[in-house]
């Protein structure tokens, strides 16, 4: 049996809402809106699976489908990282990986996807309807986030397939991806929308297949374009909160990334750029890549296996890659 985490079905406005504007005039803003929202936008997918061999452990997989290069991945649970979620792991392609209990193994699967295994026992263990979110910071697309959860009815060993239209928050939908034509179209669209703002907004219909489907602050031009139109943000109800949430410091960050260099619109310096950077004792992680990344939450330091701080004498480079945490 496969279960699926659903995103609300976004309905187009009712035909009666067209009013005096006319069908032809109304179609143009919808087309422009679709272009503005989807042009050059990548996609993030999230999978959550309860392992059949270890019924108390979860595997979370996240991937970025875009042509850009990933510069940071943040995995959180209980909601998006900047909205009450608690950071489970932060993965950086050069500085390595840091994870917090109950995360057992965070690793790069590929250059654009990661996986995280969660321990299921103990007070901080996840439960079946916990929401897990992955945020990818990439160049040049910007920062993208998607969330997913495994419904309580899921069979062990099966995963909830990624939602057809992932729950996404675009901090910047393509730094370099919007052409002048599209920009003009978007401005024109805004002009049209302002001109006709007295019209009632289209209704949002909750998904018929998911009684607990969240309400999304977005609307789509048509059912046909749903697959391409990304919902900017949605909150998922979860009845299970991590036990360690109260101990989190939402405004702090991984202390060993306190002094990440800022680099605007270019790929990182050579492979040795941060190889010898000492790991600071404390500090606040300030996002790089033109300030696109949200801060990653930090908990009090752990000395157990949940904390990974480059034991390899060759530094963080030895920790990187699909091998993940040694």
């Amino acid at each position: 049996m496969r279960t699926e985490a659903q995103v609300p079905a976004l309905q187009p406005p009712e035909p009666g809402l067209e009013g005096a504007m006319g069908h032809r005039t109304l179609v143009l803003p919808w087309v422009l809106l679709t272009l503005c929202v989807t042009a050059g936008t990548p996609e993030v997918w999230v999978q959550v699976r309860m392992e059949a061999t270890e019924l108390s452990s979860f595997t979370i997989r996240c991937g970025f489908l875009g042509s850009g290069s990933i510069s940071l991945v943040t995995v959180s649970w209980g909601g998006p990282n900047g909205a009450g979620g608690t950071t489970l792991a932060v993965l950086h392609p050069e500085r390595g990986i840091r994870q917090w209990a109950p995360a057992r193994q965070a690793r790069w699967e590929t250059q654009s996807s990661i996986s995280l295994i969660l321990e299921g026992s103990g007070a901080s263990s996840p439960c079946a309807n916990t929401t897990f979110c992955c945020k990818f910071a990439s160049f040049p697309e910007g920062s993208w986030e998607a969330c997913g959860s495994l419904p309580p009815s899921s069979d062990p060993g099966l995963s909830a397939p990624p939602t057809p239209a992932p729950i996404l928050r675009a901090d910047l939908a393509g730094i370099l991806g919007v052409s002048g034509v599209l920009l003009f179209g978007c401005v024109y669209l805004l002009h049209l929308l302002r001109r006709h703002k007295h019209r009632p907004a289209p209704r949002l219909q909750p998904s018929r297949t998911s009684p607990q489907a969240p309400r999304a602050r977005a609307w789509a031009p048509s059912q046909a374009s749903q697959a391409a139109l990304h919902v900017p943000y949605a909150t998922i109800n979860t009845s299970c909160r991590p036990a360690t949430l109260d101990t989190a410091h939402p405004h702090g960050g991984p202390s060993w990334w306190a002094s990440l260099p800022t680099h605007a619109a270019h790929r990182p310096q050579g492979p040795a750029a941060w190889a010898s950077t000492p790991i600071p004792a404390r500090g606040s992680f300030v996002s790089v890549e033109n300030g696109l990344y949200a801060q990653a939450g930090e908990r009090p330091p752990h000395t157990g296996p949940g904390l990974t701080l480059f034991p390899d004498p060759r530094g963080p480079r030895a920790m990187e890659g699909p091998l993940g945490v040694r």
């Epitope: 050069e94 590929t110 654009s112 996807s113 996986s115 050579g270 091998l323």
Partner: antibody, heavy 123, light 108 residues
Framework: QIQLVQSGPDLKKPGETVKISCKAS????????MSWVKQAPGRGLKWMGW????????TFPDDFKGRFAFSLETSASTAYLQINNLKNEDSATYFC????????????????WGTGTTVTVSS | DIVLTQSPAIMSASPGEKVTMTCSAS???SSWYLHWYQQKSGASPK???????NLASGVPARFSGSGSGTSYSLTISSVEAEDAATYYC?????????FGSGTKLEIK
């Protein structure tokens, strides 16, 4: 058309150094990791590690730490494998292999393979 | 390291026969991370099946893959002469990536 074209065969003496190139075409080079795989004559495949083509960071399994190095010439969409202080047991065919993007159906596979470079180490 | 054991090491089949080869892992491998490659003599390997059961581009539909946990298999429903090759399984459940020793398929 996506392809990985490797440099030609090489004959070396023990103690020398060999550098194999792998030129990628048909895709965005810095989006996919590049792995290297060794196949000794009549033997199976052995993974040598991979390099992140965006960050330039290399990862090696224990068996290939020390004498082996990966490098990049991003502007030429080319990856390199260098083996220092060659030994007889390094005689093999070496493949570069693109690390697949990863998807909801799988990850950690090599979706495009290079043409292979045979290195013979003999005194 | 996870050790992958392939059996049989060599097998032969006549055109039209159904063929199954297996790959046994020393510890559990998630289906996401189990893949198969085909390598013909003197050629580079090719991705054949990824994520246990997904056929790579251009692979004939007579091939299929299945399995879970520590036991996986590749099946050819009706073998053809062009299928003669060595087939390797590969895992990436835990580091490092490892390959099986291969099953060589000969066509009678």
């Amino acid at each position: 058309q996506i392809q990985l074209v490797q440099s030609g065969p090489d004959l070396k003496k023990p103690g020398e150094t060999v550098k194999i190139s792998c030129k990628a075409s048909g895709y965005t080079f810095t989006t996919y990791g590049m792995s290297w795989v060794k196949q000794a004559p009549g033997r199976g495949l052995k993974w040598m590690g991979w390099i992140n083509t965006y960050s330039g960071v290399s990862t090696f399994p224990d068996d290939f730490k020390g004498r082996f190095a990966f490098s990049l010439e991003t502007s030429a969409s080319t990856a390199y494998l260098q083996i220092n202080n060659l030994k007889n047991e390094d005689s093999a065919t070496y493949f570069c292999a693109r690390l697949g993007m990863g998807s909801t159906t799988g990850a950690g596979y090599f979706d495009v393979w290079g043409t292979g470079t045979t290195v013979t180490v003999s005194s | 390291d996870i050790v992958l054991t392939q059996s049989p090491a060599i097998m032969s089949a006549s055109p039209g026969e159904k063929v199954t080869m297996t790959c046994s892992a020393s510890s559990s491998v998630s289906s996401w991370y189990l893949h198969w490659y085909q390598q013909k003599s003197g050629a580079s390997p090719k991705l054949w099946i990824y994520g246990t059961s997904n056929l790579a581009s251009g692979v004939p539909a007579r091939f299929s893959g299945s399995g879970s946990g520590t036991s996986y298999s590749l099946t050819i429903s009706s073998v053809e002469a062009e299928d003669a090759a060595t087939y390797y399984c590969q895992q990436y459940r835990s580091d490092p990536y490892t390959f099986g020793s291969g099953t060589k398929l000969e066509i009678k």
